[in-house]
């Protein structure tokens, strides 16, 4: 007999064709011989089956000898053998209805697990293969699990259910809730205004939660909370902010913070956490601030950086348009008795300048 696979919630059309290309009497029954529907002349008649309100046919096709059974809003329990009786013949169609659902919610935090559960009719033995948006294939039976979801897992998952050499495809949209970047670094000269941005990697109609920025200054022994805020319907409202530094926060997404000026005592690392309503766990983004200061004290020209710099970064002091006088993989460099002119302090990574501060050395008479 013919096998047809259907998807829970969808509509399926089971075909039944007579040899005569005209409207004749037909009946559709289930395996218990309960009439589902049929015709009486040009009228559609329905039987006492549980499909009553979800079953239909296409009257426009009857004149061509086609008598389909249409079942709307499919349920797993609609899986059955359906019998079409026409012209003293019986056509049997086995319908197998499958459903594929995400374990809890299709909006999951980065690092959480995604479990896809297959609902299938008794007696079936389907196999499932899913392809993630980044092209990763996973296979399984009744359940498929993906641990440690990553940002690239956001998007449409395409899952194929295979049964009796037939296949049915499911598409599930998964949203991984995360910040666009796990970490960022800001390089600033002393006194400059600092802007931190925390763009989210997803968009939702309403976004509600609360967040906090904890800061570990390089010079401090412990971290402290710089700001706490609420997020309601995408509007940000500050709950509490430290007096030093006096941060400003934007009232709209993406989350945005402004530090009035970069000072050595603020250099360090921060961790912004965002707890979303009805979600367990938090979103995290690390932010780092590196501050540079160039000073001249008597006969000593010094350049210093504070904050989380990698060991491969180079700190240099050079007179404008000349070779570097001093270059070290350290956080402070100096030149004794510098010549007069415009000196540049440069923080660079493999030749790329990350931060530059200029200081004018006046001639000594």
């Amino acid at each position: 007999k013919k096998v047809v696979l259907g998807k829970k919630g969808d509509t399926v059309e089971l075909t039944c064709t007579a040899s005569q290309k005209k409207s004749i009497q037909f009946h559709w029954k289930n395996s218990n011989q309960i009439k589902i529907l049929g015709n009486q002349g040009s009228f559609l008649t329905k039987g006492p089956s549980k499909l009553n309100d979800r079953a239909d046919s296409r009257r426009s096709l009857w004149d061509q000898g086609n008598f389909p059974l249409i079942i709307k809003n499919l349920k797993i329990e609609d899986s059955d053998t359906y019998i079409c009786e026409v012209e003293d013949q019986k056509e049997e169609v086995q319908l197998l209805v499958f459903g594929l659902t995400a374990n809890s919610d299709t909006h999951l935090l980065q690092g959480q697990s995604l479990t896809l559960t297959l609902e299938s009719p008794p007696g079936s033995s389907p196999s499932v293969q899913c392809r993630s948006p980044r092209g990763k294939n996973i296979q399984g039976g009744k359940t498929l699990s993906v641990s440690q979801l990553e940002l690239q897992d956001s998007g449409t998952w395409t899952c194929t259910v295979l049964q009796n050499q037939k296949k049915v495809e499911f598409k599930i949209d998964i949203v991984v809730l995360a910040f666009q970047k796990a970490s960022s670094i800001v390089y600033k000269k002393e006194g400059e205004q600092v802007e931190f941005s925390f763009p989210l990697a997803f968009t939702v109609e309403k976004l509600t939660g609360s967040g906090e920025l904890w800061w570990q200054a390089e010079r401090a022994s412990s971290s402290k909370s710089w700001i706490t805020f609420d997020l309601k319907n995408k509007e940000v409202s500050v709950k509490r902010v430290t007096q030093d530094p006096k941060l400003q926060m934007g009232k709209k997404l993406p989350l945005h913070l402004t530090l009035p000026q970069a000072l050595p005592q603020y250099a360090g690392s921060g961790n912004l956490t965002l707890a979303l309503e009805a979600k367990t766990g938090k979103l995290h983004q690390e932010v780092n601030l590196v501050v540079m200061r160039a000073t001249q004290l008597q006969k000593n020209l010094t350049c210093e950086v504070w904050g989380p710099t990698s060991p491969k970064l180079m700190l240099s002091l050079k007179l404008e348009n000349k070779e570097a006088k001093v270059s070290k993989r350290e956080k402070a460099v100096w030149v004794l008795n510098p010549e007069a002119g415009m000196w540049q302090c440069l923080l660079s990574d493999s030749g790329q300048v990350l931060l530059e501060s200029n200081i004018k050395v006046l001639p000594t008479w």
């Epitope: 205004q193 319907n233 934007g250 009232k251 709209k252 945005h256 402004t258």
Partner: antibody, heavy 118, light 107 residues
Framework: EVQLLESGGGLVQPGGSLRLSCAAS????????MSWVRQAPGKGLEWVST????????YYADSVKGRFTISRDNSKNTLYLQMNSLRAEDTAVYYC???????????WGKGTTVTVSS | AIQMTQSPSSLSASVGDRVTITCRAS??????LGWCQQKPGKAPKFLIY???TLQSGVPSRFSGSGYGTDFTLTISSLQPEDFATYYC?????????FGQGTKVEIK
Amino acid sequence: EVQLLESGGGLVQPGGSLRLSCAASGFTFSTYAMSWVRQAPGKGLEWVSTISDNIGNTYYADSVKGRFTISRDNSKNTLYLQMNSLRAEDTAVYYCTKDNEDYYMDVWGKGTTVTVSS
Amino acid sequence: AIQMTQSPSSLSASVGDRVTITCRASQGIRNDLGWCQQKPGKAPKFLIYAASTLQSGVPSRFSGSGYGTDFTLTISSLQPEDFATYYCLQDYNYPRTFGQGTKVEIK
């Protein structure tokens, strides 16, 4: 058509109170933040207060904090500004404004005049 | 509070002229800036939001640009109905603050 109509302005003595109303129509009132902005005679625009959508967070300018109260009745599509302990410097035309989805004041009423004088 | 400084405070121009008004914020406000127009005795009319997005119904001769602290409103070809006072407004955070206004007069 989106419309905002202010009412309740008038002459009041220093120390007195006044309640301004703003009747809104032409949009789903409960889903938008609403604000009051004022303009003293011959001067520029000054933001007074904002109330967010159905959550009801409220924000005030320092110059009116503790004296003015913004509120809304979503069932009546009406925004209010209760003004107490009025001062001469509160004399202004008060405009009711609607925020758009991006929280910008995109629609303004015609204004109602408040005069604080003895 | 964030201070908004508009310049010039007034300017004289002729119909057809290209007019530029600038607005500077005392701190970075991303592109959270709007522009509105006010004619004498009338309520302000909203022109531009998010620094460069034109409010529906606003003629395309109006344009906005800028990010961070420096913003510009440009009227490419001044029309008789454009003589008015223009205000910038920071919408980065509370308190919302306006520039002091720029009056565009007929030369």
